[in-house]
C-alpha cells in the first residue's frame, strides 16, 4: 500500500501521528476494536510533549489510552516498550485495586481529570483517543 | 453450548444479491465483534468483513467493498452479510465467525459455512 | 493494505516429526497474529493468539513465537490428528489478512 501523507477528516495531526478523540464512551477493549478498524490503535504516549497534546485535546475527562496489564506486565498495544517509555502515573498508581467490587483488579491505563494516569476496571465506559502514524504504509491512496 | 448457524446460501445468478445470515446461541451475542470470513473451493481463507459488538463501526474488505454490507440485529442474536452485484469470483463457502472480545486475539468461534455459488 | 507469506506452502512430515511454519507479514504488526488449523470440509480453529497465548483446548505441542513481521508456528511432536492446512491471520489493522495456508501430509 502507499503511504499515508495526511489525516483523514476528522482527526488531528501532531508531529506526524493521526489523533482521533470520542466524544462517547466504551469499554477498554472495544475502544480499541473501533481504533482498530480505522486502522489505528488506542493512543501510545511516548514523550511529555505527546502527553500535553492529548491532554489539552480531551480535558478533564477519564479517557482510555493504549497501555494494560491484563496479562501481567505493563504493555503498550503498539509493542512500544513499557518499562524504557515514558510514563506519567498518578502517585501511589498502579495499584490493581481490587477494592471496587467489580470482580478482578485493574488492568488498563486511563487520562484522570488532571492527566495524570490511573488503572482501572477496563470494563468502565470511558472515552478514548485513536492514534496511527502518518508514515507507515496506508490503505488508503495519499490525498495530493 | 456456543454456537453459529449460517443460512441463506445457495445458486445465484451474477449481478444478483444475496443475504447471508447467522444465528448465534450460547453466548452474549451483543458482547462480541462478529465476521465474514469466505473459502473459495480449493483456495485459503479470505477475510470479508467485521462490525464491532454495538454495531459503531464496521468494515469490508476491498474485494467486496461498495458490494457489501455487514449488520447486526442484537435482539434477535443474528448477523447478516448483503452482497450486491455477485460475481463468479464471489463463489466460496461463507463463514460467520465470532471475534474475541479484543478483536487482536482472533477469531475463536466458527460456524458450519453456507455455500454460494455465483452461476448462470 | 498488509500482505501475509507463508513458507514452506505445503510439507510432509511423520508422526513424531518436529514441525515449523513462518509466517511473514509486509509491515510491523506488533505480535498480532494469530494461527488456524483447518482439516479438509471443516470449519478453521483458532490455536494461537497474540502470536504466543495458546487458545484454550489446544494441546501444548502447539507453539507460536515472533514479533513485528516474522512469526513462528511449531508442532513439538506431530500427532495423526495434526495432519491439517495451518493458517497465520494479522489481526492488527483491517482488512485482517490471512496468509495463504501451508498444507501438512502424511510423508
Known amino acids: 500500500g502507499s503511504e499515508r501523507t495526511c489525516c483523514p477528516v476528522n482527526w488531528v495531526e501532531h508531529e506526524r501521528s493521526c489523533y482521533w478523540f470520542s466524544r462517547s464512551g466504551k469499554a477498554w477493549a472495544d475502544a480499541d476494536n473501533y481504533c482498530r478498524l480505522e486502522d489505528a490503535h488506542l493512543v501510545v504516549v511516548t514523550s511529555w510533549e505527546e502527553q500535553k497534546f492529548v491532554q489539552h485535546h480531551i480535558g478533564p475527562v477519564n479517557t482510555w489510552m493504549g497501555l494494560h496489564d491484563q496479562n501481567g506486565p505493563w504493555k503498550w498495544v503498539d509493542g512500544t516498550d513499557y518499562e524504557t517509555g515514558f510514563k506519567n502515573w498518578r502517585p501511589e498508581q498502579p495499584d490493581d485495586w481490587y477494592g471496587h467490587g467489580l470482580g478482578g483488579g485493574e488492568d488498563c491505563a486511563h487520562f484522570t481529570d488532571d492527566g495524570r494516569w490511573n488503572d482501572d476496571v477496563c470494563q468502565r465506559p470511558y472515552r478514548w483517543v485513536c492514534e496511527t502514524e502518518l508514515d507507515k504504509a496506508s490503505q488508503e491512496p495519499p490525498l495530493l | 453450548q456456543v454456537q453459529l448457524v449460517e443460512s441463506g446460501g445457495g445458486v445465484v445468478q451474477p449481478g444478483r444479491s444475496l443475504r447471508l445470515s447467522c444465528a448465534a446461541s450460547?453466548?452474549?451475542?451483543?458482547?462480541?465483534?462478529m465476521h465474514w470470513v469466505r473459502q473459495a473451493p480449493g483456495k485459503g481463507l479470505e477475510w470479508v468483513a467485521v462490525?464491532?459488538?454495538?454495531?459503531?463501526?464496521?468494515k469490508c474488505a476491498d474485494s467486496v467493498k461498495g458490494r457489501c454490507t455487514i449488520s447486526r440485529d442484537n435482539s434477535k442474536n443474528t448477523l447478516y452479510l448483503q452482497m450486491n452485484s455477485l460475481r463468479a469470483e464471489d463463489t466460496a463457502v461463507y463463514y460467520c465467525?465470532?471475534?474475541?472480545?479484543?478483536?487482536?486475539?482472533?477469531?475463536?468461534?466458527w460456524g458450519q459455512g453456507t455455500t454460494v455459488t455465483v452461476s448462470s | 493494505d498488509i500482505q501475509m507469506t507463508q513458507s514452506p506452502s505445503s510439507v510432509s512430515a511423520s508422526v513424531g516429526d518436529r514441525v515449523t511454519i513462518t509466517c511473514r507479514a509486509s509491515?510491523?504488526?506488533?505480535?498480532?497474529l494469530a494461527w488456524y488449523q483447518q482439516k479438509p470440509g471443516k470449519a478453521p480453529k483458532l490455536l494461537i493468539y497474540?502470536?504466543?497465548s495458546l487458545q484454550s483446548g489446544v494441546p501444548s505441542r502447539f507453539s507460536g513465537s515472533g514479533s513485528g513481521t516474522d512469526f513462528t508456528l511449531t508442532i513439538s511432536s506431530l500427532q495423526p490428528e495434526d495432519f491439517a492446512t495451518y493458517y497465520c491471520?494479522?489481526?492488527?489493522?483491517?482488512?485482517?489478512?490471512f496468509g495463504p495456508g501451508t498444507k501438512v501430509d502424511i510423508k
Open positions: 491471520q494479522q489481526t492488527n489493522s483491517v482488512p485482517f489478512t
Open positions: 509491515q510491523g504488526i506488533s505480535s498480532w
Open positions: 450460547g453466548f452474549t451475542f451483543s458482547s462480541f465483534g
Open positions: 497474540a502470536a504466543s
Open positions: 462490525i464491532l459488538n454495538d454495531g459503531s463501526n464496521k
Open positions: 465467525a465470532r471475534g474475541q472480545q479484543w478483536l487482536v486475539n482472533g477469531v475463536d468461534v
